[in-house]
């Protein structure tokens, strides 16, 4: 949908450019002004398929709210227009560009504010509660290890300066239910809690209010807790090699453990013909394992030089720790020198990889 | 208590290698990290690098990265750092700290708290 | 790198005065700012985090504000055992930066 130009503006319009993506406008308009939000595609490259979003919500067009793919106006502004306005991709919600807007009685000087997280009653300006720093508040999902700390943020300003309280789950939220307690910063407009427990899980929202309004914003907090397990061995190491006669190959394998692991680097023989033993357990020569001088991450690389047709077959990484085993394998091919192979090929023969 | 105990210093010619340890104990060392931080002889303060013991991710101060290497074993509480092609500006008391984090809504970092030090261990690199 | 330049590098005071050290980032932090205490052959003590939090087991005599650049630490009434070197730190910026120090001597 396109904005008409048809559309008339009533007051004085301020139309703003974008910021960068990541930073933020602060806008102040005067009340009966036009706002205008321009979010030029970011790059200049193609912008897709965009949506308006104004305190969370998507922004419906009307008579009033003109609605574009890289502007918005919102037409004969009042208190209620004041606000955190977003730009976002419609398909990732990915967010373009940031706004906060603010309409005061006075009519507007074209001046941004500072950007202050505190409001101060000026006796001057009053209105609704509104977000001032949204960009504060992108992560709506904390997932944090237990024994670290977690600060939620609800920066906010209006006239009079607002109260903030919090919730968990819906139910108001003090620092005496849970153990630790709680630390509140109301000039910063935020919450910590230190040493999280997987009792703190759930949701916390923040409510901003004055006699204006009010405002507020949830956020998930989501403990993580250790659980033990054998090593985890990345996926695609080590990766099957094809390597000429005489050359150099190098296998990998990435290890993910919480105890110590043990790593080993095997490789699969034959002994009487025979792949397995009676106990269908493979035969295997240790080419690598750990050592007084040894690192783990010299052990991740099993290094084979000047590889001979012997040095085919099937390689195995091994890791293991106080819970378990796991292992990956990988196989050599190993191919005649490049003279042997123009040879073979003049004689008619083919090699097969 | 949360007690931490460096070991391992010593003099070492320039160009040599030392390993340095840290025994961490009292706190959840798989959800928390290690840093370890230096300070010359009557200088101020430098963060050298940490580990997080969550996910092994490792950090560096430019003066020291591909020289210095921080790792640890988890199942021994125990984070290492292993100093190779040292040089007389590398001479310094290391101290490790016990380190959490502080996960903001705020995407843009992790703070990172360095709350419980060891008692230190001088490191000379010297001729 | 983020700079941080504390001012000044050294006061003297009396027991009971009020102390007052600035530290200065060379771009924005926010508020991820920590500030340490150190006595010689000491390891430091960490006495403030997120600038304004005072960590547990400090004296409340000990106060940290400020966000974005300018960080302020105030001792309100020094103490015998404050007499030491206090350094702030950032932690939002990679790497990790201390300030210079500053060094609170007995008048």
């Known amino acids: 949908e396109s904005l008409g130009t048809e559309q008339r503006v009533v007051g004085r319009a301020a139309e703003v450019p974008g910021p960068e993506p990541g930073q933020q406008e602060q806008l102040v308009f005067g009340s009966g002004d036009a706002v205008e939000l321009s979010c030029p595609p970011p790059g200049g490259g193609p912008m897709g398929p965009t949506v308006w979003v104004k305190d969370g919500t998507g922004l419906v067009p009307s008579e009033r709210v003109l609605v574009g793919p890289q502007r918005l106006q919102v037409l004969n502004a009042s208190h209620e227009d004041s606000g955190a306005y977003s730009c976002r991709q419609r398909l990732t919600q990915r967010v373009l560009c940031h706004f906060s807007v603010r309409v005061t009685d006075a009519p507007s000087s074209g001046d941004d504010e500072d950007g202050e997280d505190e409001a101060e009653d000026t006796g001057v300006d009053t209105g609704a509660p509104y977000w001032t720093r949204p960009e504060r508040m992108d992560k709506k999902l904390l997932a944090v290890p237990a024994a670290n700390t977690v600060r939620f943020r609800c920066p906010a300003a209006g006239n009079p300066t607002p109260s903030i309280s919090w919730l968990k789950n819906g139910r108001e939220f003090r620092g005496e239910h849970r153990i630790g307690g709680i630390k509140l910063r109301h000039q910063q407009w935020s919450l910590v809690m230190e040493s999280v427990v997987p009792s703190d899980r759930g949701n916390y929202t923040c409510v901003v209010e004055n006699k204006f309004g009010s405002i507020r914003q949830t956020y998930t907090l989501d403990v993580l807790e250790r659980s033990p397990h054998r090593p985890i061995l990345q996926a695609g190491l080590p990766a099957n090699q094809t390597a000429v006669l005489g050359s150099d190959v190098e296998f990998h394998c990435k290890v993910y453990s919480d105890a110590q692991p043990h790593i080993q680097w095997l490789k699969h023989v034959e002994v009487n013909g025979s792949k397995v033993g009676p106990d269908g357990t493979p035969y295997v020569t240790v080419l690598k394992t750990a050592g007084a001088n040894t690192t783990d991450k010299e052990l991740e690389v099993l290094s084979l030089h000047n590889v001979t047709f012997e040095d085919a077959g099937e390689y195995t990484c091994l890791a293991g720790n106080s819970i378990g085993f796991s292992h990956h394998s990988a196989w050599l091919v190993v191919l005649p020198a490049e003279e042997e192979l123009v040879e073979a090929d003049e004689a008619g023969s083919v090699y097969a990889g | 208590e949360v007690q931490l105990v460096e070991s391992g210093g010593g003099l070492v010619q320039p160009g040599g290698s030392l390993r340095l340890s840290c025994a961490a104990s009292?706190?959840?060392?798989?959800?928390?990290?290690i840093s370890w931080v230096r300070q010359a002889p009557g200088k101020g303060l430098e963060w050298v690098g940490r580990?997080?013991?969550?996910?092994?991710?490792?950090n560096y101060a430019d003066s020291v990265k591909g020289r210095f290497t921080i790792s640890a074993d988890t199942s021994k509480n125990t984070a290492y750092l292993q100093m190779n092609s040292l040089r007389a500006e590398d001479t310094a008391v290391y101290y490790c700290?016990?380190?959490?984090?502080?996960?903001?809504?705020?995407?843009?970092?992790?703070?990172?708290?360095?709350?419980?030090w060891g008692q230190g261990t001088l490191v000379t690199v010297s001729s | 790198d983020i700079q941080m330049t504390q001012s000044p590098s050294s006061l003297s005071a009396s027991v009971g005065d009020r102390v007052t050290i600035t530290c200065r980032a060379s771009q924005d932090v926010d508020t991820s700012l920590a500030w340490y205490k150190q006595k010689p052959g000491k390891a430091p003590k960490l006495l403030i985090y997120s600038a304004s939090f005072l960590y547990s087991g400090v004296p409340s005599r000990f106060s940290g504000s400020g966000s974005g650049t300018d960080f302020t630490l105030t001792i309100s009434s020094l103490q015998p055992e404050d007499f030491a070197t206090y350094y702030c730190q950032q932690s939002t910026g990679h790497p990790q930066t201390f300030g210079q120090g500053t060094k609170v001597e007995i008048k």
């Open positions: 580990y997080w013991a969550w996910d092994g991710s490792t």
């Open positions: 700290a016990r380190t959490y984090g502080i996960y903001d809504t705020y995407d843009k970092y992790t703070e990172y708290v360095m709350d419980y």
């Open positions: 009292g706190f959840p060392f798989t959800s928390q990290g």
